[in-house]
């Protein structure tokens, strides 16, 4: 978001008429309230970064994120008999990703058409609310999953209904929290008509000068409360987990668990480095610069960081892969275009040939699902 200049002589309330047009003159329109952007911001809004690079990234995220998270949600809801806390958190993670990714065709079209939003104020607000909602939901559910993974290693007790209920309660609390913290994004007017560029932007230009300080305080609060604190918890969980796995006995099974745990840690670390850290850092820096200088010199970086934050919808399936046996099996079979039933039949014939020898690494049973490493 960049700071737009309100050219209305009467000023405007928090939610007011922005791109209202009174009458047409020649080929243009006469605007009642108008916003102006600086040349650098205009060059970003009309340049290849926003009109070519962003739609490419969003298309990749949509093409990868929609089917993988859709399959994950289906697996966790209908193909996993025992709903362990990890399964519950991953199902919520997949749901958060889907709720964000389903709006991407509109986002892609918006950027391809030169950052011109033609779908109305309400849809823009929904898109932005879900965009940020997904990022913060992902951070919180990832934190829950990380803490839960550590808890499983420290306290390797069987599945209990109580644990699942606690996980459901925590998940509902997270959804409620995210709904509350994203309310300002739904309330604030996000679409602005820029006469100089003849485009209506969605979230890319800040509608109110009065909002500059509010937006800075808002994103700073979110960066501290919904990013830094959960990031610290996640990091702590993984540091303790590595310590536990290092000190544990090294048999073949625990070695596999350790390798998978390391892969999970690397995946989550990558997610923080690519998706969450740059976006949260640049959100704060960007709004601080607008608040203090009236313009942001990091606007292009901020745009890229927000774009990269959506990659979490593509990285999350790797988390499911390293945590859930069921998802791992369904993912393998989907990629190999095989059904789970076919694989099960193959396994039955293999086990009958090899007598009663167990192959734990290929276990895909829905009744005896293990979601630990």
């Amino acid at each position: 978001t960049i700071q737009g200049t309100n050219r209305s002589s009467k000023g405007r309330s928090l939610i007011g008429k922005v791109d209202g047009t009174s009458h047409v003159t020649g080929k243009g329109v006469t605007v009642e309230t108008v916003f102006s952007v600086d040349e650098f911001s205009a060059s970003v809004l009309t340049g290849k970064l926003t009109t070519v690079f962003l739609p490419i990234v969003y298309t990749i995220v949509f093409v990868v994120g929609l089917p993988s998270n859709g399959m994950a949600l289906w697996v966790f809801l209908f193909r996993t008999k025992k709903k362990h806390p990890a399964v519950i958190y991953m199902a919520n993670l997949a749901l958060a990703d889907l709720l964000s990714v389903i709006w991407f065709p509109l986002k892609i079209a918006y950027h391809i058409h030169g950052n011109n939003w033609i779908y109305g104020e309400a849809l823009c607000n929904v898109l932005i609310g879900f965009f940020y909602g997904n990022m913060y939901c992902s951070i919180l559910f990832m934190t829950c999953l990380s803490v839960q993974r550590y808890w499983v290693i420290v306290n390797p007790m069987g599945h209990s209904r109580k644990k699942a209920n606690i996980a459901i309660g925590i998940s509902l609390a997270i959804w409620l929290l995210i709904l509350l913290v994203t309310i300002p994004l739904y309330v604030v007017k996000q679409t602005i008509f820029i006469p100089a560029l003849n485009i209506t932007t969605c979230h890319d230009v800040l509608p109110e000068q009065l909002l500059v300080g509010d937006m800075f305080n808002y994103f700073l609060s979110l960066a501290i409360g919904v990013f830094l604190f959960p990031a610290f918890l996640t990091a702590s969980a993984y540091v303790l987990m590595i310590r536990m796995l290092r000190s544990s006995a090294m048999d073949e099974n625990s070695e596999k668990k350790r390798k998978r745990a390391i892969k999970l840690i690397v995946t989550v670390l990558a997610m923080y480095l690519i998706c969450f850290t740059p976006s949260n850092l640049l959100l704060v820096v960007h709004y601080f610069l607008i608040k203090s200088q009236g313009q942001s010199h990091v606007y292009a970086l901020y745009i890229v960081a927000l774009c990269l934050s959506t990659l979490n919808s593509c990285i999350d399936p790797f988390v499911y892969y390293f945590v859930s046996h069921d998802f791992r099996d369904h993912a393998k079979n989907a990629l190999l275009c095989r059904s789970v039933r076919t694989v099960k039949q193959m396994q039955v014939s293999l086990t009958s040939k090899k007598h009663s020898r167990k192959s734990s690494s290929y276990s895909s049973s829905s009744t005896t699902v293990k979601t630990s490493y």
Epitope: G28, S36, D38, A196, N198, Q209, Q293
Partner: antibody, heavy 119, light 106 residues
């Protein structure tokens, strides 16, 4: 070089309209906006309105409904029409070039057109 | 609407003296403030834009400073041709001119 040449002085009756022209040279009207400013005798400068290179316009609230700014790219001329003239509209009207962006000033000005409203 | 207040209304100085003109905004305009010079019977001429950037062809004796709400135009050593009316203009939120400061020969 960049130049803005305005039409000559006008004497108008109250209630009538006046149309002031501003011919641009040395730059394209499709790439630049033109703003209009007026100055009553012995008074300060007053911003009236703007037309962008793409034809979009915006007027100061004080003049909304009375002012119309247009541009003709073929002749590189911008126009400002003020209707329902009153005696207090007696002023020198200036046009100026503007790049259309927030961080750009009004860098080149026309010589001004004196409009006298008198019965 | 942002109101710009220029002071003093009139500044009486001799050639060679330093002139300091003030422009105060009713709210933060960041760096988006320009200075214009106007001589009798002439159109305004851009001197300084975005607080401190010197416009093309303007002598180095003119300089601008400030940020936020308080801005200053300084003429280090007045030349005879510098005696005129000076206006500030903010373009951060709307376009508004200050009332002007007349720099006259003492």
């Amino acid at each position: 070089q960049v130049q803005l040449v305005q039409s000559g002085a006008e004497v108008k009756k109250p209630g009538s309209s006046v149309k002031v022209s501003c011919k641009a040279s040395g730059f394209s009207l499709s790439s630049y906006g033109v703003i209009w400013v007026r100055q009553a005798p012995g008074q300060g400068l007053e911003w009236m309105g703007v037309i962008w290179g793409n034809g979009n316009t915006y007027y100061a609230q004080k003049f909304q409904g009375r002012v119309t700014i247009t541009a003709d790219e073929s002749t590189s001329t911008a126009y400002m029409e003020l209707s329902s003239l009153r005696s207090e509209d007696t002023a020198v009207y200036y046009c100026a070039r503007w790049r259309g962006y927030k961080d750009y000033p009004f860098d080149y000005w026309g010589q001004g057109t004196l409009v006298t409203v008198s019965s | 609407e942002i109101v710009l207040t220029q002071s003093p209304a009139t500044l009486s100085l001799s050639p060679g003296e330093r002139a300091t003109l003030s422009c105060k905004a009713s709210q933060n305009v960041y760096k988006y403030l320009d200075w214009y010079q106007q001589k009798p019977g002439q159109a305004p001429r851009l001197l300084i834009y975005n607080t401190n950037s010197l416009a093309t062809g303007i002598p180095a004796r003119f300089s601008g400073s400030g940020s936020g709400r308080d801005f200053t135009l300084t003429i280090s050593s007045l030349e005879p041709e510098d005696f005129a009316v000076y206006y500030c203009l903010q373009h951060n939120s709307g376009w508004t001119f200050g009332g002007g400061t007349k720099v006259e020969i003492k």
